[in-house]
């Protein structure tokens, strides 16, 4: 007998999602228009390519990276796409309302789509901690709250701390990680007897997760350089990110082997550790003056990632109910913090090098920014978790966690598909 979507969700989801989509269309109709200025077409194409890289990262990279569960791979990929599509629409409007609205209309440019895709990426990072335990109706709520929280965080940081697009978007790693972990903490944790096999990884889904990791690995330099305002800063960011992720791959594979008693390589470690360098270098990728520093960062990040993957899952599974293979949350939280610390160190070196007496104040500002990002992530994450626990969403029963058949129509109804 095939498992069906609960009746109430079948009524609730289409109504909720389509009403929301209709509302978004109306908001776009009344409040937005395209940038009408004529521009050099070559520049337009180049600008679009950066946005395309970000979309590939989000849809294919993060979509497949989270698809390693034996019985939840379809849902991981498709739900990611659903959240990305919804998140980008809401993020474009929100960013426009927060930054442009005094002029009466939100002007949509390729840059605003780029920003929106990066905001939506935040949700895709966070959701790794809860995928398999929530339905689409709940994910819609999560998208709306997280994109709103991140948009407001960026606006506050921009206004209070005077930071640019790149700097306030690079808090995304820490923000997304802590948001996801705090939502996971609120959701029902125990996996009932008989469902343990569902949160295990299988060979084919693990291969698709590796494919996701490869796409992220290839396009991470685009992500870290997308919001920088000059060619020289972008060039630096691309080079440094590339060196960092290259070293973190070598470190991840060799470190994973080192961490295993028989010297075997863990798929789960490798999936996430290959990206470690890109996350750690993100905040300061345009500032790092030479390749060796980016490479050292990639090495340290890879080791932290493998170490975290070895020792943290037990704790996360007990406390937060996060399965062993969903290690993006705590991985990004550690590596995001490392990246922020590196930025603060570089800031201090710059201040010392300039003979500037403002070191303490500059460090305090940076710590203030980071603390604000973590606090808003935790608070909005807890709020989202509480909202997701409301009965109206008809959350999947714990026995139906990590099960594609709850959500998808499979003609052959095979359990192992």
């Amino acid at each position: 007998m095939s498992s069906k979507y609960p009746r109430s969700v079948r009524r609730c989801l289409p109504l909720w999602a389509l009403t929301l989509e209709a509302a978004l269309i109306l908001l776009f109709y009344f409040f937005t228009h395209y940038d009408a200025s004529l521009e050099d077409q070559k520049g337009l194409v180049a600008s679009y390519q950066v946005g395309q890289d970000l979309t590939v990262m989000a849809a294919i990279g993060l979509g497949f990276l989270t698809s390693s569960f034996r019985r939840h791979s379809w849902s991981s990929v498709a739900f990611n796409l659903f959240m990305l599509a919804l998140g980008v629409q809401w993020a474009i409007l929100l960013d426009g309302f927060l930054s442009q609205f005094p002029s009466g209309k939100v002007v949509i440019t390729l840059f605003s789509i780029r920003l929106a895709t990066m905001s939506a990426l935040s949700v895709l990072i966070s959701v790794d901690a809860v995928l398999g335990k929530v339905n689409l109706a709940q994910l819609v709520v999560m998208v709306l709250v997280e994109v709103t929280a991140l948009g407001n965080l960026r606006m506050v940081i921009s206004n209070i701390f005077n930071t640019d697009y790149h700097m306030n978007m690079m808090h995304i790693y820490v923000f997304a990680a802590y948001f996801g972990l705090s939502v996971a903490w609120c959701l029902p944790k125990p996996l009932p007897e008989g469902t343990e096999d569902k949160d295990q990884t299988a060979t084919i889904p693990s291969l698709s997760a590796m494919l996701g990791a490869l796409f992220l690995w290839m396009f991470w330099p685009s992500f870290n350089s997308a919001l920088l305002r000059s060619p020289i800063e972008r060039k630096n960011a691309v080079f440094n990110t590339y060196y960092a992720v290259a070293v973190s791959v070598v470190t991840a594979i060799s470190g994973s082997s080192l961490a295993h008693p028989q010297g075997k390589i863990s798929k789960t470690y490798v999936h996430s550790a290959v990206l470690a360098g890109g996350v750690a270098v993100g905040t300061s990728c345009h500032l790092i003056p030479s390749p060796w520093l980016a490479m050292v960062l990639g090495l340290v990040a890879g080791l932290i990632s493998v170490g975290g993957a070895k020792y943290l899952p037990g704790c996360c599974n007990r406390v937060l109910g996060i399965p062993h293979s969903s290690i993006m949350g705590y991985n990004f939280s550690l590596l995001g913090l490392l990246g922020e610390i590196i930025y603060i160190v570089l800031l201090v070196l710059d201040t010392v090098g300039a003979g500037n007496g403002m070191i303490g104040f500059q460090v305090l500002l940076s710590i203030g920014e980071l603390s604000l990002a973590i606090v808003i992530a935790l608070m909005s994450g807890l709020l989202t978790g509480l909202l997701l626990n409301l009965k109206i969403w008809k959350a999947p029963h714990e026995a139906k966690y990590f099960d594609d058949q709850v959500f998808w129509k499979f003609p052959h109804l095979a359990v192992g598909f």
């Epitope: 390729l110 070196l349 710059d350």
Partner: antibody, heavy 126, light 106 residues
Framework: EVQLLEQSGGGVVQPGRSLRLSCAAS????????MHWVRQAPGKGLEWVAV????????EYADSVKGRFTISRDNSKNTLYLQMNSLRAEDTAVYYC??????????????????WGQGTLVTVSS | AELTQSPSSLSASVGDRVTITCRAS??????LNWYQQRPGKAPKLLVY???SLQSGAPSRFSGSGSGTHFTLTITSLQPEDFATYFC?????????FGQGTKVEIK
């Protein structure tokens, strides 16, 4: 090679009407630099108006001109534009285009407006 | 960040040492530039990143400061230095300018 920013398009215009300023660049790789418009009302200080990134991907405006002015560039023609709509008396000023250069400090990047156009006067009057 | 220059004008003689101050409403790190504008001309960059002298600018101009408090010093005023001086922050958009300091002949 001498870096030049040659401005044109200023003049007298009635309130509510439109005007388009141009700034033709030569002597440097135009597509590698962010470009700005800065204005100066008669007898007053300098006021930043707008910026466009090197690849045209992003534009930012001063609150006083948001929704009325549009900055754009054509990298194939080495030209920067400022389309000014719904002009008001308070928009009367000399408008300058300026090149933004990014230079590395000890570690952080620093920005400077190292080359300026000669300026073009826009008078909004009925 | 808003910038406030002082004094708004000053009178000095050739050979004098002149100091102009610029205060920011919030920390702008080292993102501060100084420009000189002669009557009827476009502004010209003198000093960038607080203390770096722009190529072609005379060495009698120097900048200093940190965080929120900055100064431009002209060690020995020359006849061609009688002009208006503006500070500008390039820390974040909008890239605001100070209101200007006019240096006049005594």
């Amino acid at each position: 090679e001498v870096q030049l920013l040659e401005q044109s398009g200023g003049g007298v215009v009635q309130p509510g009407r439109s005007l388009r300023l141009s700034c033709a660049a030569s002597g440097f790789t135009f597509s590698s630099y962010g470009m700005h418009w800065v204005r100066q009302a008669p007898g007053k200080g300098l006021e930043w108006v707008a910026v466009i990134w090197f690849d045209g991907s992003n534009k930012e405006y001063a609150d006083s001109v948001k929704g009325r002015f549009t900055i754009s560039r054509d990298n194939s023609k080495n030209t920067l534009y400022l389309q000014m709509n719904s002009l008001r008396a308070e928009d009367t000023a000399v408008y300058y285009c300026a090149r933004e250069e990014v230079v590395r400090g000890v570690i952080l990047w620093s920005r400077k407006f190292d080359y300026w156009g000669q300026g073009t006067l826009v008078t909004v009057s009925s | 960040a808003e910038l406030t220059q002082s004094p708004s004008s000053l009178s000095a003689s050739v050979g004098d040492r002149v100091t102009i101050t610029c205060r920011a409403s919030q920390t702008i790190g080292r993102y501060l530039n100084w420009y000189q504008q002669r009557p009827g001309k476009a502004p010209k960059l003198l000093v960038y990143a607080v203390s770096s002298l722009q190529s072609g600018a005379p060495s009698r101009f120097s900048g200093s400061g940190s965080g929120t408090h900055f100064t431009l010093t002209i060690t020995s005023l020359q006849p061609e230095d009688f002009a208006t001086y503006f500070c500008q922050q390039s820390y974040s958009s909008p890239f605001t300018f100070g209101q200007g300091t006019k240096v006049e002949i005594k």
